[in-house]
Every structure is written in structure tokens, then in C-alpha cells.
């Protein structure tokens, strides 16, 4: 249905308050050098236009589109050359190119200072003081360093950001209340945006077929009572959703997935019987409950699939009249049934079913040829399940930061190339799969721990499209976004990589580090692994981990020293001529 | 409620045409395979044909070039087209729903049926 | 493919185990299914692919079979059970065939 203003149509539509913290969001996800100051007087400009519209929607430029207002505000900021270099070509364009330019400028890992944490007294203060901007300082700082981030449920958080304080600033300990609460909201807000970004790269990088097969599969493993065209219908909107956030139309997205949250509710009975409770919340609690409700019962009564898929003479006559139905009903019917596999796997036998009838359906024999296509997802699925499970059984033996240690060895000698940084964070990620899927039952694992790999092995991606320094990398970031995970798993040892030369200052260390809390001083001793990888990437696992001994040792030691700088000094130098000697550098 | 109601039976002479209806409601026809089956008096049930998820119909061979099977998914509705009807068509029609889009079977759902006469 | 179902009609009392062997003229794996009807009605699921018990059906019945040959067996007759029963065989292509039915009744 269209509006003669677009503007005032979202702004009537999601309210004010709503409005003018999308706007905020969209401005601070495109420009995240901006001062905090710059962007609220953007946003209340925009909003006060907005108002206008409301009140005639003919007055002058209320016609005009959100991408064109947006971006003539944004090209109004004066500092653009200077702070931004080149996107400030962004401004020569017209809509739609100027919008792809800016989305195009998205900065994954900008060059940001770390959000440190005040005080809670002061914290507190501030949110008394002035409780708007402290809440869109929030939004702000969020939406700047997560450029991709979900923006609906950005105000979800904020909504959740907002209760923390206002319930743990009149507490008897606040900080007891209230600094639990934000490290949820932290660790939670970092994997939303991971997962986000995921969303996002699927939908750019590999189309929307992609993203819809992705789609199809989550969809039908969570409502497996709903009928084909019920989901159809839902990816059909929930794609709408996630390409309008991904693309900085965020008014937009907001809007539908409101409205799709509504037809769910409308019409929970026909998809799925665990909605009851998200059904019964207000808006942005009921939007988040639904995106992670569980799986529904499987129905009773369903038939083997091989009857109509492998068996059935008219298989090549179904494919090729109705490729889509045919290949989207397949993936429906094998995910309804698999609650157990990982979306990933379901895409990857989806894939090797359509590559297997492309082929069989021109031989001579097609039947004779398809046959036995079933057979070949047995190694399909049992190659994630092995790695499940020994990966699990060494993380019960090592512990998260143990594991952690042997990832990020591993890693580092798959593709030493990137930068040491970079294989701290993803390592961790990767570790932290551990503690989040390995207590599950076995039915449970495989969709946990896979379906979380490919979230953190597309920051990897991201993060290393931006700088691109490995070869390997790149092929399995770019060939298959199903097969990323195997990809990276298949890699052995990078032979042409020539070691890092020593640098005695990369393993010197102060007496800060006695200071620091256990997470950050985990990240300073596996930021010194990955060193001592990259300088020695044939050192044996008991090499390594007798160097790691000492180094924790030594740090344990001065730590309790008198004279902690001049420990670190003196049996520095030792630690690092013993570990030369023990790693014959 | 998930249920199927065949209309559009009745009397019709040798030679003659009549189009059945099977109406949908509870579910979406778009997501099955549909199928007509028919009984005649105290004989066994035989099978006429099928409209898939893909819109493709498939017919039992003595059906084919008489029984024209279609949908409308906007009216949720499955027909079946007969015509040069003769008096060995005579029989109860029923409409049933295949277990997926592109099932042959089995039949979990079933209309009632209606009735069709041929005879002068 | 065709289906022969044998006997065509069959009696027999309240308490007793009853057999009905349906064959198809080739090979349909496991995809076979048995239907129960009462006049006036239509056919009702009892079981689906040779053996699975469709929600709702008696424990008293069930299917066994493969390949060509199958069985639909009742432990344990009970009134409700006399009717017809028609095997239905599926999935080779997107056609389906129907046995011609078994007639229950009571001795």
C-alpha cells in the first residue's frame, strides 16, 4: 500500500520514541566516528521533519524516500572528508548507489576505544540525571561498534538496559544488582550482533536464495506441525525483515517485523503450540521470544521421505517442473524431521540432493541413478557428529581456556596469516562452543554447536575480508557458506607460511598485567601463544604447553612479588631465553 | 477444524459433463498433493489421479484424457473435471489429501464423499 | 503395479487373531498402507510404510512386510473391528494403487 510520505507513515507507525532511536541506530550504524552530540541533533532535525509530514503529509520533501532524506542528512555533517576519507564520495551519488556506498563503508572493526565501565555510583547518577540521554548514549555506543546489529532488538536491549538501572540503582548493594545484569546484557548483546552478522553476510555476500534455504530449514525444525505453505509464507516475510535491516532500512524492518510478530501471534495455532507465552508479552518482548522459541513436537504420523524423493520413478518430472517447490519441499520435509541436525548439515544434503538429481536427471537411467542418493548423506552426517563428539570429550578434559588454547594453536597453524588479534577472538569464540553445547544430550548438540561455529567463523570472515592477508581463508569464506565449517576443519598445517621472526618486546610483560581482571590476563597469555605459533608453527603441543607452564608460573610469581616491574624485568629475560631454547628458536 | 467437503455430485446423462469440488479448510491445499478417489457401489476403491505442490497432475492410466484434475489455492479448492461420463462412472467421489506435496500416499484425510449417477 | 488381497472376505469372532496378506506384483519396499472402512464412510489410516501405527489406532493392530509381500494382523478381534480393509500401495511413481478389500464379518 503506498503512502504519499513514507516518513510520516513510519513514524506514525512505530511512535515517537521508537522513531527517533531507529534513526539514532541507522546514523550511528553508518557514521561510527561521529561524536554522540552529532548524531542526536541529526536525529531530532529528522524528527522534527518527520512531524511535519505527520501533520501534511504533502508539505515539501515529505514524498521524498527514507534512503534519500537519511542521506542528505548524513552528507550534511562537516567533517565528513576528514573523518571518513573516502565514503565522503558516498555524497556524489544518487539513491540507490549512495546508500549502497555508505553500506558498502560499514566498518566491522572500527577503530573504536574500548567501552570501559564507570563506577556503578556514577553510572547511576548519570541515568538519574538525565535517563534519554543516558539510554541513547547506550543505543549509540551499540550501534556504532555493531554496525550490523539487529536493530529491533537493539531496543529490546535498551528496553532490558533501561530496567537494570531503574530497578538496581535504588538496591541496598547496587553494584551486586546491577553489574551481573549489564555482563548478560554484554555477552548477550555480542553474540546477537554475531548472529545478526551471519544473517547479514548471507543475504549479501550469497543472495537471497541462500538466506530463504536457510530460512526454510530453521523455520521447519522450530514449527514442524506447520504446513509448507505456512512456512513459506513466514520466510517469505522474515526475509523482507532481515534484507531491509541489513540494508540500513531500519524503519522499515522494524515496522514488518512488528507485523510479523502479529500474524504469528494471529495465527499461533496453525504454527506451533510453544508460542502461547511469547504471544501473551508487549511488542519487543514478544518479537525476541518468538526469533528464540523452541522447537515444537514433531507431528505424528509422518511418513518416510524416500518414497517420494528417491523411490518414485517421477522424481526427474517433479524436479524439473517445479525446481523450487520440489528442492524447498524436500529441505521442509528433512528438517521437520531433523531437530537434531544443524541447519548447516540440512542446506549441505539439500545441496548434494539438487546436485545429485541435476545429474541424474539428464543420465539414461535416472532412477538407477538416484537411488541410492540417500546413502550419501551418511558421511555427510556423521563427519559433524565425530567432530562433536571428540571435540567434546577434549573439552571435558581440558576446560573452556584449555580448550580455547588448543583451538587457537590449531587455528594459528591453519592460517598463521591473520592477524594475532583476530585468532584471540575467534579462538575464544570458538572455544566458548564448548561450555555452551557440549552439556546438551546428543540430540541437542549438533544444532547447538555447528549452527554456533558458523556464527563465529563468519567473524572470522568479516573481519578478515576487511584485511585480507590468507588465501585459505578467503576460499573458505567465499565458496560455500554451508561448507565453512568443514572448510576451515579440512585445513592442515599452512607449510608455505615462513615463520614470524623473534621479537623479544612481543613477549615482555609488565607488572600491569597483575592488575587486570582473569579474562583479560587469559587474553594476554593467549595473545603471547599465538606469538609463539606464528614464530614456531612446528612446535609440539608438550612444547608448547611447557612454555605456557612456565609462562603462568612466572606470572603467578611476580605477581606476588615486593618488586613486581623489576621481577617482570629480570625473569623475563630468562623466560624468554628458556623458552627459545625449549622451542629451539 | 482440518476437514475436505466434495460437492458438485449428482444424476447426468451418458456422455454428459460434471465438475466436482473439494473445498479446503483448517490447512492449505497449496502444501499437498490432492487426490480423487472413487467408489462404485460395493466395489473397491480406485484411484483417479493427483494435482502436486508443483501443479502437476498425475492420472491412473484409464482416467487419462476424461479426468482433468486443477486448484484454485486462492479459493482453496481442488476440482475434478469429467467428461464422456458413462454408466460404469457411477460411484461415490472422494477427495483426499496426499501426506505431503508430492505423496502418492497415504491418505490420512478424506472427504465424505459425494455421489455420482450416470444414467439416461 | 497391482495388489492382490486375499481372502476377499473373511469371518470370525470377537477375541480371535485375524491375518489379511496383501501382494503387489513388484517390488514397493516398505510402502504399503492399510485402510479400514465402514459403510458410509470413508477409508480410515490404520497403519502407513508396512508397519508404523498411524496416532490413534488400537495397539491391536498391526502391519508387517516388504518388497512384495505384507500382512495386516488384528491380536484381538474386537466388535468395531468388522469392516472393510483395503491395502494401498505407494511412492513407486506418483501414481498409487488400491487392493481390491477384505470383507470382515462376524462368524
Known amino acids: 500500500d503506498a503512502h504519499k510520505s513514507e516518513v510520516a507513515h513510519r513514524f506514525k507507525d512505530l511512535g515517537e520514541e521508537n522513531f527517533k532511536a531507529l534513526v539514532l541506530i541507522a546514523f550511528a550504524q553508518y557514521l561510527q566516528q561521529c561524536p554522540f552530540e552529532d548524531h542526536v541533533k541529526l536525529v531530532n532535525e529528522v524528527t522534527e521533519f518527520a512531524k511535519t509530514c505527520v501533520a501534511d503529509e504533502s508539505a515539501e520533501n515529505c514524498d521524498k524516500s527514507l534512503h534519500t532524506l537519511f542521506g542528505d542528512k548524513l552528507c550534511t555533517v562537516a567533517t565528513l572528508r576528514e573523518t571518513y576519507g573516502e565514503m565522503a564520495d558516498c555524497c556524489a551519488k544518487q539513491e540507490p548507489e549512495r546508500n549502497e556506498c555508505f553500506l558498502q563503508h560499514k566498518d566491522d572493526n572500527p577503530n573504536l576505544p574500548r567501552l570501559v565501565r564507570p563506577e556503578v555510583d556514577v553510572m547511576c547518577t548519570a541515568f538519574h540525571d538525565n535517563e534519554e540521554t543516558f539510554l541513547k548514549k547506550y543505543l549509540y555506543e551499540i550501534a556504532r561498534r555493531h554496525p550490523y546489529f539487529y536493530a529491533p532488538e537493539l531496543l529490546f536491549f535498551a528496553k532490558r538496559y533501561k530496567a537494570a538501572f531503574t530497578e538496581c540503582c535504588q538496591a541496598a548493594d547496587k553494584a551486586a544488582c546491577l553489574l551481573p545484569k549489564l555482563d548478560e546484557l554484554r555477552d548477550e548483546g555480542k553474540a546477537s550482533s554475531a548472529k545478526q552478522r551471519l544473517k547479514c553476510a548471507s543475504l549479501q555476500k550469497f543472495g537471497e536464495r541462500a538466506f530463504k534455504a536457510w530460512a526454510v530449514a530453521r523455520l521447519s525444525q522450530r514449527f514442524p506441525k506447520a504446513e509448507f505453505a505456512e512456512v513459506s509464507k513466514l520466510v517469505t516475510d522474515l526475509t523482507k525483515v532481515h534484507t531491509e535491516c541489513c540494508h540500513g532500512d531500519l524503519l522499515e524492518c522494524a515496522d514488518d517485523r512488528a507485523d510479523l510478530a502479529k500474524y504469528i501471534c494471529e495465527n499461533q495455532d496453525s504454527i506451533s503450540s510453544k508460542l502461547k507465552e511469547c504471544c501473551e508479552k508487549p511488542l519487543l518482548e514478544k518479537s525476541h521470544c518468538i526469533a528464540e522459541v523452541e522447537n515444537d513436537e514433531m507431528p505424528a504420523d509422518l511418513p518416510s521421505l524416500a518414497a517420494d524423493f528417491v523411490e518414485s520413478k517421477d522424481v526427474c518430472k517433479n524436479y524439473a517442473e517445479a525446481k523450487d517447490v520440489f528442492l524447498g519441499m524436500f529441505l521442509y520435509e528433512y528438517a521437520r524431521r531433523h531437530p537434531d541436525y544443524s541447519v548447516v548439515l540440512l542446506l549441505r544434503l539439500a545441496k548434494t540432493y539438487e546436485t545429485t538429481l541435476e545429474k541424474c536427471c539428464a543420465a539414461a537411467d535416472p532412477h538407477e541413478c538416484y537411488a541410492k542418493v540417500f546413502d550419501e548423506f551418511k558421511p555427510l552426517v556423521e563427519e559433524p557428529q565425530n567432530l562433536i563428539k571428540q571435540n567434546c570429550e577434549l573439552f571435558e578434559q581440558l576446560g573452556e581456556y584449555k580448550f580455547q588454547n588448543a583451538l587457537l594453536v590449531r587455528y594459528t597453524k591453519k592460517v598463521p596469516q591473520v592477524s594475532t588479534p583476530t585468532l584471540v577472538e575467534v579462538s575464544r569464540n570458538l572455544g566458548k562452543v564448548g561450555s555452551k553445547c557440549c552439556k546438551h544430550p546428543e540430540a541437542k548438540r549438533m544444532p547447538c554447536a555447528e549452527d554456533y561455529l558458523s556464527v563465529v567463523l563468519n567473524q572470522l570472515c568479516v573481519l578478515h575480508e576487511k584485511t585480507p592477508v590468507s588465501d585459505r581463508v578467503t576460499k573458505c569464506c567465499t565458496e560455500s557458506l554451508v561448507n565453512r565449517r568443514p572448510c576451515f576443519s579440512a585445513l592442515e598445517v599452512d607449510e608455505t607460511y615462513v615463520p614470524k621472526e623473534f621479537n623479544a618486546e612481543t613477549f615482555t610483560f609488565h607488572a600491569d598485567i597483575c592488575t587486570l581482571s582473569e579474562k583479560e590476563r587469559q587474553i594476554k597469555k593467549q595473545t603471547a601463544l599465538v606469538e609463539l605459533v606464528k614464530h614456531k608453527p612446528k612446535a609440539t603441543k608438550e612444547q608448547l604447553k611447557a612454555v605456557m607452564d612456565d609462562f603462568a608460573a612466572f606470572v603467578e610469581k611476580c605477581c606476588k612479588a615486593d618488586d613486581k616491574e623489576t621481577c617482570f624485568a629480570e625473569e623475563g629475560k630468562k623466560l624468554v631465553a628458556a623458552s627459545q631454547a625449549a622451542l629451539g628458536l | 477444524e482440518v476437514q475436505l467437503v466434495e460437492s458438485g455430485g449428482g444424476r447426468v446423462q451418458p456422455g454428459g459433463s460434471l465438475r466436482l469440488s473439494c473445498a479446503a479448510s483448517?490447512?492449505?491445499?497449496?502444501?499437498?498433493?490432492m487426490n480423487w478417489v472413487r467408489q462404485a457401489p460395493g466395489k473397491c476403491l480406485e484411484w483417479i489421479g493427483h494435482i502436486n505442490a508443483g501443479d502437476i497432475a498425475y492420472y491412473a492410466t484409464w482416467a487419462k484424457g476424461r479426468f482433468t484434475i486443477s486448484r484454485d489455492n486462492s479459493k482453496n479448492t481442488v476440482y475434478l473435471q469429467m467428461n464422456s461420463l458413462r454408466a460404469e462412472d457411477t460411484a461415490t467421489y472422494f477427495c483426499?489429501?496426499?501426506?505431503?506435496?508430492?505423496?502418492?500416499?497415504?491418505?490420512?484425510?478424506w472427504g465424505q464423499g459425494t455421489q455420482v449417477t450416470v444414467s439416461s | 503395479f497391482e495388489l492382490t488381497q486375499s481372502p476377499s472376505s473373511l469371518s470370525a469372532s470377537v477375541g480371535d487373531r485375524v491375518t489379511i496378506t496383501c501382494q503387489a506384483s513388484e517390488s514397493i519396499n516398505s510402502r504399503l498402507a492399510w485402510y479400514q472402512q465402514k459403510p458410509g464412510q470413508p477409508p480410515k489410516l490404520l497403519i502407513y510404510?508396512?508397519?508404523d501405527l498411524t496416532s490413534g489406532v488400537p495397539s491391536r493392530f498391526s502391519g508387517s512386510g516388504s518388497g512384495t509381500d505384507f500382512t495386516l494382523t488384528i491380536s484381538s478381534l474386537q466388535p468395531e473391528d468388522f469392516a472393510t480393509y483395503y491395502c494401498q500401495g505407494y511412492g513407486g511413481s506418483s501414481t498409487t494403487t488400491f487392493g481390491c478389500g477384505t470383507k470382515l464379518t462376524v462368524l
Open positions: 510404510d508396512a508397519s
Open positions: 483426499a489429501r496426499g501426506a505431503g506435496g508430492f505423496s502418492t500416499g497415504p491418505f490420512k484425510l
Open positions: 483448517g490447512f492449505s491445499l497449496s502444501s499437498y498433493a
